[in-house]
């Protein structure tokens, strides 16, 4: 018996087609992805093949103005239109709190939403009961397939699930649910979830009875053969893991942003064992037509976005200096504003010992592309912020050793004075440079804000200590020459859309007046 699994993950509100790098589509003839194009390909495969499941491994939420405006209603609407069969909860599905998940998505989705390792307690338990499930048994042709969900247990540090949801260890939570499916005579089981490729592989290895793992969170690109675009494969598709009980378990993921549709063909024997598996992600490039009916619906929903872009988010009573002349040479107040917003967006008081789990922000000055003049009645709009942060990036959470941070700050000024983008703006950090010293030895003082303290204060950076830092995904991926970050980071979790972080902060503060306050000094 053959099953075709079509899968997406980490779509991050890319409902419209995007450029090849998943930013805003500029030249339509070269654009990719989007739900209208995805629908064309899904329908084509459904037409051709008998037993097809369309699955999503989480993080539909967060990433573009679509989510900012529609807050998840767009996800439910278009996933319903594409007739998804199941979805796993990702960490970003909790970005607007539990209510922001329940109302727009859980109550509106016409497909099961899954996670076996999230347990509700207190008053939430009855409110959310039945709105998401640990597993679902789906009829596919003449057979049944069990889908069991999982979500990153780090979600409380990455999003806003509140205090009434407990995120258990994935493997511990999955095993009893898979066992239950086995007792129900379900012998074909897919683990669908959002914990990253390393955990996907562990689940394949450790959870008895799981036949296939469809993952997300780490934006992993797997491919067999010559890859069709810029993404470099982390391994073959599917990635085969030998389980502890000796089975070959295919593990798949389909990069991110709706650029690819994962296509996995599995052959089962009559006892539900995987006999063979093969496939590849399908690049959704512009040679695949956008479905006109879905496209028309997208255009209808778009109207509200255009209106939103020009609405006032808040006010500034000072000039927001985002000029290259400032942000690539010295501390600039636009850099301070953005870093303060980044830290504010990551306030998670999860432990009595820590006032927060992260206190530091770094931001490449070259990523700040425009100032905002306060003389326009102080008004700040989404449109203004899109000029400051035009690349559609995210502000991510990483863990780095102090020694890596020191290297990063040395890199920040290694060729100072040439208006290059690597000069770092900061938050929760005090740095002093001496430019008379040779490159690689210019950081004379580097103090960081403590987290394990009731009264935050600045302490010298410790080389061997592991620190959490918020930074743009561009830096996490080694951009602007920050190869040491990419090479040495100990953990990387993708965060919220950059503009969304800053706009939310401005809306919250209502009136802003960031200053230049001595975060960066030259001796």
């Amino acid at each position: 018996w053959e099953l075709t699994i079509l899968h997406t993950n980490d779509v991050h509100s890319r409902l419209e087609q995007t450029s090849e790098d998943s930013s805003k589509c500029v030249n339509a003839s070269r654009c990719m992805g989007g739900v209208a194009r995805l629908f064309t390909k899904v329908q084509q495969i459904r037409r051709a093949e008998p037993n097809v499941l369309l699955l999503d491994a989480g993080d539909q939420y967060q990433g573009t103005i679509w989510f900012t405006v529609y807050k998840g209603a767009e996800v439910a609407h278009f996933m319903n239109a594409l007739r998804y069969d199941a979805m796993a909860l990702g960490n970003h599905e909790f970005d607007n709190g539990v209510e922001g998940l329940i109302e727009p998505l859980l109550k509106e989705a016409k497909f099961p939403i899954l996670s076996a390792n999230i347990k509700a307690k207190g008053p939430l338990a009855s409110q959310i009961s039945g709105l998401y499930l640990p597993y679902k048994v789906l009829p596919v042709g003449d057979e049944v397939v069990g889908i069991v969900g999982y979500t990153s247990k780090e979600t409380p540090f990455l999003s806003n699930p509140g205090t009434n949801l407990v995120f258990e260890d994935e493997i511990t939570a999955l095993q009893p649910e898979v066992d239950k499916l086995k007792t129900l005579n379900v012998n074909k089981i897919i683990a669908l979830g959002h914990s990253g490729f390393e955990m996907d592989k562990l689940i394949a290895q450790k959870v008895r009875g799981v036949d296939v793992v469809v993952g997300g969170h780490s934006n992993t690109f797997l491919y067999t053969g010559n890859p069709p675009s810029k993404e470099v494969p982390a391994g073959k598709y599917p990635f085969i893991v030998t389980s502890d009980d000796g089975r070959k378990v295919p593990v798949v993921q389909a990069y991110a942003f709706g650029k690819y549709l994962g296509y996995l063909k599995i052959e089962f024997d009559e006892r539900g064992n995987v006999i063979s598996s093969h496939g590849n992600p399908i690049l959704l490039n512009s040679s695949i037509p956008e479905d006109p009916s879905i496209k028309a619906d997208i255009n209808k929903w778009r109207i509200k976005l255009d209106n939103y872009s020009t609405q006032e988010l808040g006010k500034t009573i000072v000039y927001l200096d985002g000029s290259s002349q400032s942000c690539r040479f010295r501390e600039c107040n636009m850099g301070n504003l953005i870093c303060d917003a980044m830290i504010n967006n990551n306030l998670r008081h999860t432990d009595e010992m820590f006032w927060n789990h992260v206190s530091m922000c770094i931001l490449n000055g070259g990523g700040i592309r425009s100032p905002i003049d306060e003389r326009n009645n102080g008004t700040i709009t989404w449109e203004n912020l899109a000029a400051v942060l035009p690349f559609g990036g995210t502000f991510d959470l990483v863990q780095l050793k102090g020694s890596t941070l020191k290297k990063a700050f040395e890199h920040s000024v290694h060729r100072y004075g040439q208006s290059t983008g690597e000069f770092l703006q900061v938050g929760g950090i005090h740095v002093v440079y001496d430019l008379s010293r040779k490159p690689g030895d210019r950081v004379v003082k580097l103090d960081v804000l403590c987290t394990k303290c009731r009264v935050p204060s600045y302490d010298p950076l410790k080389m061997d200590e592991v620190y959490k830092v918020i930074l743009p995904n561009f830096l996490a991926n080694g951009g602007d020459g920050f190869q040491m970050i990419k090479d040495e980071l100990l953990r990387h979790d993708s965060g919220d859309q950059d503009i969304n972080v800053v706009s939310t902060y401005i809306s919250k503060m209502k009136v802003i007046y960031p200053a230049v306050e001595g975060r960066i000094k030259f001796s």
Epitope: I45, R47, A48, E49, P50, I282, L283, S287, I288, P289
Partner: antibody, heavy 121, light 107 residues
Framework: QVQLVQSGAEVKKPGASVKVSCKAS????????LSWVRQATGQGLEWMGE????????YYNEKFKGRVTMTRNTSISTAYMELSSLRSEDTAVYYC??????????????WGAGTTVTVSS | DIQMTQSPSSLSASVGDRVTITCKAS??????VAWYQQKPGKAPKLLLY???YRYSGVPSRFSGSGSGTDYTLTISSLQPEDFATYYC?????????FGGGTKLEIK
């Protein structure tokens, strides 16, 4: 290399049936669609229908519904098109053509050489 | 059914000429248009797919454009081997339909 080899020419009487075969090689037979297209002498191309060998799913042009049957034998990578109740206007060259539904080339990328079917009393 | 109206039905041109063939669909076919070249006694050959994508091995003098209902095949500089009949086809909805063909002859 990809090849679609069709069966030889046929001469049939009106009211009879004809079954044309198309043997595929050089690719995974079950991972592509196969369409049948005909062309009367000096005329244009006319799509008759398609079969997806992996599933056996068929979709026919309404014009031929009830008269055309498309089948496949995956063990020998061969597709068949049977047309019944033949009439003189069915005299044409019949082509099988491959369609890559998993890729992005929206068109028929490989064609058989064609099978001439003559309907004459 | 979607009608594909191809024009002109025949065309005389010389080697080196630039030639344009158009195809109009009776409804939006969302760039799901292919162009084929056919020589007498032979099967058609795929030239372009998805309106503007050249199929592998097809010379760069062949190009395509269009969206919605209007599509164009252009041969920038005719070569002797280009004299043949050209067909457009919509692959958007079944039944997939072809244009009536354009016979390109030597002037």
């Amino acid at each position: 290399q990809v090849q679609l080899v069709q069966s030889g020419a046929e001469v049939k009487k009106p009211g009879a049936s004809v079954k044309v075969s198309c043997k595929a090689s050089g690719y995974t037979f079950t991972s592509y669609g196969l369409s049948w297209v005909r062309q009367a002498t000096g005329q244009g191309l006319e799509w008759m229908g398609e079969i997806y060998p992996g599933s056996g799913n068929t979709y026919y042009n309404e014009k031929f519904k009830g008269r055309v049957t498309m089948t496949r034998n995956t063990s020998i990578s061969t597709a068949y098109m049977e047309l019944s109740s033949l009439r003189s206007e069915d005299t044409a060259v019949y082509y099988c053509a491959r369609y890559d539904y998993l890729g992005s080339s929206y068109g028929f990328d490989y064609w058989g050489a064609g099978t001439t079917v003559t309907v004459s009393s | 059914d979607i009608q594909m109206t191809q024009s002109p039905s025949s065309l005389s041109a010389s080697v080196g000429d630039r030639v344009t063939i158009t195809c109009k669909a009776s409804q939006d076919v969302s760039t799901a248009v292919a162009w084929y070249q056919q020589k007498p006694g032979k099967a058609p050959k795929l030239l372009l797919y998805s309106a503007s994508y050249r199929y592998s091995g097809v010379p760069s003098r062949f190009s395509g454009s269009g969206s919605g209902t209007d599509y164009t095949l252009t041969i920038s500089s005719l070569q002797p081997e280009d004299f043949a009949t050209y067909y457009c086809q919509q692959h958007y909805n079944t039944p997939y339909t072809f244009g009536g063909g354009t016979k390109l002859e030597i002037k």
